[in-house]
């Protein structure tokens, strides 16, 4: 058993049918010695008397808010949460496996640039009685500070018969060094509590591996005289790191017909313009990627050919 | 060419070669399903690798003030990786495919290090750790880790030379 925060304790349990559970001794936080009784949650049933209460915790029915009283007055509370271990593996019931980029991916994180700011998000089908707490650091043995805000509900989607809820959090490395080569990964730890269940989720990454630039901005077409060709031009997104002579992007320009089956013409360039042939009813799209490190491509910015 | 005395390197040549290094490093080890090599007991390998750190002057301001600190750090790294790629980690079993980009990568690392430091001048170089994995699978894992680490290193080097070529070239 360990303390999550003041008066909230986590009991770690091996979880299988007829498991013996864990013996827990609760102590009433009071100088009083006599006439103390104990109850659980909203029940008035007296579970025991005395300054300490010994319980065998086997299932969620044994967890909850234990309260010690004397003469109708509440003396103190202890909230017991359970953390399940099934076949030697901590449970992951609360969050959905996003399966991208690999199985058992519960937290996904992205950064728009090298400033040390990043966003992480996760999914759940649980709608109520859910709290998250996020901590982060650079490295684990001698951790350097990363400050995270509060996790917030950022999206709701209908998936078949169920609703899916997306939560996200923004974090910022306290002393970020955008130009340096990272040697220690960022660690992100999310504590999730649903009703009386505690779970924790972690992710470890380098900022360079989670970079995904915003799409190029100000995408424009300029027809070339007496030609089906057009000059496409665009700019670096505002959110990208500066100076651009140092933090350079590379671009992919695509001409796509109306039908998805039509052949796509693609051009790769380090410049912020390109000359392409504009077909009728086609659209031109441009996306960006770090020029020197193959992290994610941005989403496409698009304009119609006409 | 960069000399320890402090004259400028051939920024544009360095830019071109470092960008080629980036391409080669990624073709030598593309991101295989985002294989997370950090889970595989990283400490002994990549802790000894020279990283371009915050105080090395490789940021735009540091380059403007005095690019020599940064260039020396990059040179150290290039020599380090050049030796690793020439070691039995890469020459031993399992043999690399004949068309593997590792050979080109090795040659380009050497080429860029020579651009930075002509013969007769010597910056101190870092000691190569004695990594001699006994099993072929260990060697394979070590290759992946070294290449992943090299990708990060050459990305920073390429940024330095691109910025230098754009802003510091005479």
């Amino acid at each position: 058993i360990w303390e999550l925060k003041k008066d909230v304790y986590v009991v770690e349990l091996d979880w299988y049918p007829d498991a013996p559970g864990e013996m827990v001794v609760l102590t009433c936080d009071t100088p009083e010695e006599d006439g103390i009784t104990w109850t659980l949650d909203q029940s008035s049933e007296v579970l025991g008397s005395g300054k300490t209460l010994t319980i065998q915790v086997k299932e969620f029915g044994d967890a909850g808010q234990y309260t010690c009283h004397k003469g109708g007055e509440v003396l103190s509370h202890s909230l017991l949460l359970l953390h399940k271990k099934e076949d030697g593996i901590w449970s992951t019931d609360i969050l959905k496996d996003q399966k991208e980029p690999k199985n058992k991916t519960f937290l996904r994180c992205e950064a728009k640039n090298y400033s040390g700011r990043f966003t992480c998000w996760w999914l759940t089908t649980i709608s109520t009685d859910l709290t998250f707490s996020v901590k982060s650091s650079r490295g684990s043995s001698d951790p350097q500070g990363v400050t995270c805000g509060a996790a917030t509900l950022s999206a709701e989607r209908v998936r078949g018969d169920n609703k899916e809820y997306e939560y996200s959090v923004e974090c910022q490395e306290d002393s970020a060094c955008p130009a340096a080569e990272e040697s220690l990964p960022i660690e992100v730890m999310v504590d999730a509590v649903h009703k009386l269940k505690y779970e924790n989720y972690t992710s470890s990454f380098f900022i360079r591996d989670i970079i995904k630039p915003d799409p190029p901005k100000n995408l424009q077409l300029k027809p070339l005289k007496n030609s089906r060709q057009v000059e496409v031009s665009w700019e670096y997104p505002d959110t990208w790191s500066t100076p651009h002579s140092y933090f350079s992007l590379t671009f992919c320009v695509q001409v796509q017909g109306k039908s998805k089956r039509e052949k796509k013409d693609r051009v790769f360039t380090d410049k912020t313009s390109a000359t392409v042939i504009c077909r009728k009813n086609a659209s031109i799209s441009v996306r960006a990627q770090d020029r020197y490190y193959s992290s994610s491509w941005s989403e496409w910015a698009s304009v119609p050919c006409s | 060419r960069a000399v320890p005395g402090g004259s400028s390197p051939a920024w544009t040549q360095c830019q071109q070669l470092s960008q080629k290094l980036c391409t080669l490093a990624w073709s030598a080890h593309p991101l295989v399903g985002h294989m997370d090599l950090r889970e595989e007991g990283d400490e002994e390998t990549t802790n000894d690798v020279p990283h371009i750190q915050c105080g090395d002057g490789c940021d735009p301001q540091g380059l403007r003030d005095n690019s020599q600190f940064c260039l020396q750090r990059i040179h150290q790294g290039l020599i380090f990786y050049e030796k690793l790629l020439g070691s039995d980690i890469f020459t031993g079993e399992p043999s690399l495919l004949p068309d593997s980009p590792v050979g080109q990568l090795h040659a380009s690392l050497l080429g860029l290090s020579q651009l930075l430091q002509p013969e007769g001048h010597h910056w101190e170089t870092q000691q190569i750790p004695s990594l001699s994995p006994s099993q072929p699978w260990q060697r394979l894992l070590l290759r992946f880790k070294i290449l992943r680490s090299l990708q990060a290193f050459v990305a920073v080097a390429a940024r330095v030379f691109a910025h230098g070529a754009a802003t510091l070239s005479p």
């Epitope: 049918p17 949650d41 029915g61 019931d93 649980i126 109520t128 609703k163 649903h194 | -």
Partner: nanobody, 124 residues
């Protein structure tokens, strides 16, 4: 709209059996735990039995252990309560309830969705 609909209640003699059913709709309950609660006239709603999302873990109130069996059909979104050797103290309105998140609880306050209830009366 999420709905839990109980059926199977009725008036029986002491010693008889009844099988209660609960049909769940409006969402997939495959990841939810399900429970049965009962409320006798003038008393609080109390826990009877519950089953986790996969059906492999069940829990019972002391007074019904060995007589009642809870089960579920995940495909049909159904939960059942087989009640044997009924006694007059089993009389009350029986409610089906669901809680998100795989595991069952014994406290009514933890359940997210409730049915309207079905009356069970056991005469002596």
């Amino acid at each position: 709209e999420v709905q839990l609909v109980e059926s199977g209640g009725g008036l029986v003699q002491a010693g008889d059996s009844l099988r209660l059913s609960c049909a769940a709709s409006g969402r997939s309950f495959s990841n939810d735990a399900m429970g049965w609660f009962r409320q006798a006239p003038g008393k609080e709603r109390s826990f009877v039995a519950a089953i986790n999302w996969s059906g492999e873990l069940t829990g019972y109130a002391g007074s019904v252990k060995g007589r009642f069996t809870i089960s579920r059909d995940g495909v049909e979104n159904m939960v059942f309560l087989q009640m044997n050797s009924l006694v007059p103290e089993d009389t009350g309105v029986y409610y089906c309830a669901a809680v998100e998140g795989r595991d069952y609880y014994r406290g009514a306050q933890y359940y997210d969705y409730w049915g309207q209830g079905t009356q069970v009366t056991v005469s002596s």
